[in-house]
């Protein structure tokens, strides 16, 4: 079943079917005997009941109130009253564009992330029954589809897929042809989830150390979830058997981002462990960032300005 | 719509440098980083490093250290490639491409190298 | 560095056929941070830049037909045409984005028998 015409300003294009379904349908059908009216009101007319008679274009049924179609002198204030309901539309029809498929200002925006799922469904629920055909068009361009009964795009967006696309229902009614036209306006956008991945902390890290010991270099950062973080030391990681690199912990941020931490032992320090560079990369589709730690021993400590070590 | 676009052929003395650019357009310049893709005549691709868009950081091959420079102006959009010291091996059709999986190519730059 | 090595060095398939490219790496790109294995397949025809094919192992490039698909994880990984079309005449390259320098296979030459 149709949902109701629950918004009361509607704007329409001239020369297309068109239907107003009051909010109370369900109550209406039990109440069989009740009275139910549609009225109209425009400028300087009050409130005129509207029926068949009143127009050829109207058509009246249990709790809709059709045009076939609908034309710029049907703008005005329509009325559905039952008993001690009411409902009010402002209804806005405006000229059609006759030098393009869709009317400007009936077009329905949506932003596509690129690389996301991107559909375009050409359905038409109420008019269902009556609809001969539908195409779809691209820039006013047909698109050559398999379903011409609703044709659909399902694809991943891609930024060629950016334009309008207007879907056309073709449909007859005593004996005259009509269409329906629902054009989206489809912008695709970059990837606005990812971030630029940060590494936390100063770029160059002092750490004080003594000899013999044991020293856990730990490297954060805020990234993306298929960014990687990886420590980069010595002309070939994984020569010295006193480093380890432990397992990354991640913990997603409720933005939907990642905070990890990569942690570098270094147990049993030895000379060759001292002034060295170790680097705590993190790489994305963006590109790199890097961090370093060096070790230095205690004793050398008072060489250095005590705002870049870190413990 | 979206591309890069690369500067025309060139032609190059042994010795001398030559120096590729990479003009993006389309997209949002610094969320990729751009890549430089070198193909010998008859060759496979050589990933020859990479420049971080959003930060100047560079990782290069290490056969080409000392010789490649990567470098870009965000405010046109453009990765540049300078290589010096040519050698006739360095003969190759220059690519940029953009991100790690490289989803978008540039059209190719010849670059000869002949005495 | 890790070492991408491709096979065969050349295929004939014939038309409608099912083609296979493998690729080996040297060390594994995967990560267990996040189950994902970076590798991607590229299609390069004569006179023109390489095309992607596949990126993350096995999710396809929009716009790649669907007979194209990539699989396998950690060191070895599977380019598979369902069935083979003359326009599917061209070099095959996988390449890891895992670590720098981000390394390239041989190249892969397709032909139809």
């Known amino acids: 079943a149709e949902s109701c015409t629950s918004r009361p300003h509607i704007t329409v294009v001239e020369g297309e079917p068109f239907y107003l379904k009051h909010c109370s349908c369900s109550l209406a059908h039990e109440i069989e005997t009740t009275t139910k009216s549609w009225y109209k009101s425009s400028g300087s007319q009050e409130h005129v009941e509207l029926n068949p008679r009143s127009s050829s274009r109207i058509a009246l049924h249990d709790c809709v109130l059709e045009f076939w179609p609908v034309e710029l002198n049907d703008t005005g204030s329509y009325f559905f009253q039952m008993k001690n309901y009411t409902q009010k539309w402002k209804l806005n029809v405006i000229r059609r564009n006759k030098h393009s498929c869709f009317t400007e200002r009936q077009v329905t925006s949506k932003i596509v992330e690129v690389k996301k799922f991107f559909q375009i469904t050409c359905e038409n629920s109420y008019y269902q029954t009556l609809v001969n055909s539908t195409s779809l068009y691209k820039n006013c361009k047909k698109l050559l589809l398999e379903n011409n009964k609703n044709p659909t795009i399902k694809k991943n967006a891609e930024f060629e897929d950016q334009g309008y696309y207007s879907c056309v229902h073709f449909l007859h009614h005593n004996g005259k042809l009509f269409n329906i036209t629902k054009t989206f306006n489809i912008t695709i956008v970059e990837d606005r989830s990812n971030i630029v991945p940060v590494l936390l902390g100063p770029k160059l890290n002092h750490v004080a150390v003594e000899l013999g010991k044991n020293v856990r270099l730990n490297c954060s950062a805020l990234l993306n979830e298929e960014d990687v973080i990886y420590w980069m030391f010595g002309e070939e990681n994984g020569s010295d058997p006193n480093i380890h690199e432990e397992k990354e912990m991640r913990i997603m941020t409720p933005e939907g981002k990642w905070h990890a931490s990569k942690v570098l032992r270094i147990e049993n320090i030895g000379e060759s462990n001292l002034n060295v560079l170790y680097n705590c990369t993190v790489a994305s589709t963006g590109g790199t960032d890097t961090k370093s730690f060096i070790l230095v021993r205690k004793a050398d400590m008072a060489d250095i300005p005590g705002h870049v070590f870190t413990r | 719509q979206v591309q890069l676009v690369q500067s025309g052929a060139e032609v190059k003395k042994p010795g001398a440098s030559v120096k590729v650019s990479c003009k993006a357009s389309?997209?949002?310049?610094?969320?990729?980083?751009i890549s430089w893709v070198r193909q010998a005549p008859g060759q496979g691709l050589e990933w020859m490093g990479w420049?971080?868009?959003?930060?100047?950081?560079?990782n290069y091959a290490q056969k080409l250290q000392g010789r490649v420079t990567m470098t870009t102006d965000t405010s046109t959009s453009t990765a540049y490639m300078e290589l010096r010291s040519l050698r006739s091996d360095d003969t190759a059709v220059y690519y940029c491409?953009?991100?790690?999986?490289?989803?978008?190519w540039g059209r190719g730059t010849l670059v000869t190298v002949s005495s | 560095d890790i070492v991408m090595t491709q096979s065969p060095d050349s295929l004939a398939v014939s038309l409608g056929e099912r083609a296979t490219i493998n690729c080996k790496s040297s060390?594994?790109?995967?990560?267990?941070?996040?189950?994902?294995?970076?590798l991607a397949w590229y299609q390069q025809k004569p006179g023109q830049p390489p095309n992607l094919l596949i990126y993350?192992?096995?999710t396809r490039e929009s716009g790649v037909p669907d007979r194209f698909s990539g699989s396998g994880s950690g060191t070895d990984f599977t380019l598979t045409i369902s069935s083979l079309q003359a326009e599917d005449v061209a070099v095959y390259y996988c390449?890891?984005?895992?670590?720098?320098?981000?390394?390239f296979g041989q190249g892969t030459k397709l032909e139809i028998k």
């Open positions: 491409a953009r991100g790690w999986y490289f989803d978008l």
């Open positions: 389309g997209y949002n310049f610094i969320s990729y980083g």
């Open positions: 420049i971080t868009t959003y930060n100047g950081n560079t």
């Open positions: 060390q594994s790109v995967f990560y267990s941070s996040n189950n994902k294995n970076y």
């Open positions: 993350w192992a096995s």
């Open positions: 390449q890891q984005y895992y670590r720098t320098p981000y390394t």
